[in-house]
Amino acid sequence: PGPPAGSPRVSSDPRADLDSAVLLTRSLLADTRQLAAQMRDKFPADGDHNLDSLPTLAMSAGTLGSLQLPGVLTRLRVDLMSYFRHVQWLRRAAGPSLKTLEPELGALQARLERLLRRLQLLMSRLALPQAAPDQPAVPLGPPASAWGSIRAAHAILGGLHLTLDWAVRGLLLLKTRL
């Protein structure tokens, strides 16, 4: 090995990665909110919809104070990976009725992917354990009907909205601990 030489700084550091993750999550939350509103306008929901294959909400307002960095990032990444797969599935399985929302769903999927990459980079830079994202517990088969895919879209967007909402709060809280 040669004499010690310095390395130029790379593009970001863990704290900048966390800032970037917060911005991406906020922007994704706004997109999801807007898309969910569009869904409600076009296809009014008759009550709450859920899908067994969606992750259960990780956090409540009461548990925010006890959050630990590894737990939040791991859970957030696993949950977002699940939502990413569900959006992918929705785009493939959607009937003609949902095709009008294809550009928005495509953009949502791309932003989810970006956020997932940013979270993974942050976890790598901090050297936190990275659990392999589980496949959906329930295999995602084609929806039973056109109405089935609309109900699934309501459930996916609603769940993603709640997940991103706690994610923003959780990540902001973690910023103070890094």
Partner: antibody
Framework: EVQLLESGGGLVQPGGSLRLSCAAS????????MHWVRQAPGKGLEWVAV????????YYADSVKGRFTISRDNSKNTLYLQMNSLRAEDTAVYYC???????WGQGTLVTVSS | QSVLTQPPSASGTPGQRVTISCSGS?????????VHWYQQLPGTAPKLLIY???ERPSGVPDRFSGSKSGTSASLAISGLRSEDEADYYC???????????FGGGTKLTVL
């Protein structure tokens, strides 16, 4: 400018011990996970161990588990690797690396031979 | 034997475009883990060339680009130059190790 400077390498007999150090500067050491990666002469890179930014997580390659211990002192911006029960196959240049790894030191040579 | 598989050697003439592949499995690259690429010039330490599949650290020329698809990734070098002659390594996180795994390395020769 980021600097990682390894020290502590040298010649040691099989079964012996060595402690490597890595002094870091030019970045927020306490915000980065830190790795040791080694490279045997003429061979490729082999990951050895990692410690999380705050020291709470430590993981090792199977080849060194139970013999090597990684640690860090964030107040001194220093990473350590305690190597015990050294074997001939541990002969390599040992690099200290930060993050992904994003930054690498220049390495320190460890030779295990009788 | 490396967990990530790379061709041991690659070559090209100045100005050419060269691609180096990195093949993983469903437990690392295929599980959504990002791929990073390193360049090691003769007698020096490795240097980060591409991170998160396709991002370039500041200071790395845009002749270097990365991509990932399924369980494999690739590094492309366009406008090959003599100073690109080096060993190139891919790496990805492996959850079974809780650490990164490296490819065996590809020796690039500029003819």
């Amino acid at each position: 400018e980021v600097q990682l400077l390894e020290s502590g390498g040298g010649l040691v007999q099989p079964g012996g011990s060595l402690r490597l150090s890595c002094a870091a500067s030019g970045f927020t050491f306490s915000s980065y996970g830190m790795h040791w990666v080694r490279q045997a002469p003429g061979k490729g890179l082999e990951w050895v161990a990692v410690i999380s930014y705050d020291g709470s997580y430590k993981y090792y390659a199977d080849s060194v588990k139970g013999r090597f211990t990684i640690s860090r002192d964030n107040s001194k911006n220093t990473l350590y690797l305690q190597m015990n029960s050294l074997r001939a196959e541990d002969t390599a240049v040992y690099y200290c690396a930060a993050g992904v790894p994003d930054y690498w030191g220049q390495g320190t040579l460890v030779t295990v031979s009788s | 034997q490396s967990v990530l598989t790379q061709p041991p050697s690659a070559s090209g003439t100045p100005g050419q475009r060269v691609t180096i592949s990195c093949s993983g499995s469903s437990s690392n690259i295929g599980s959504g883990y990002d791929v990073h690429w390193y360049q090691q010039l003769p007698g020096t330490a490795p240097k980060l060339l591409i991170y998160s599949n396709e991002e370039r650290p500041s200071g790395v020329p845009d002749r270097f680009s990365g991509s990932k698809s399924g369980t494999s990734a690739s590094l492309a070098i366009s406008g090959l130059r003599s100073e690109d002659e080096a060993d190139y390594y891919c790496a990805a996180w492996d959850p079974s190790l809780s650490g990164p795994v490296f490819g065996g390395g590809t020796k690039l020769t500029v003819l």
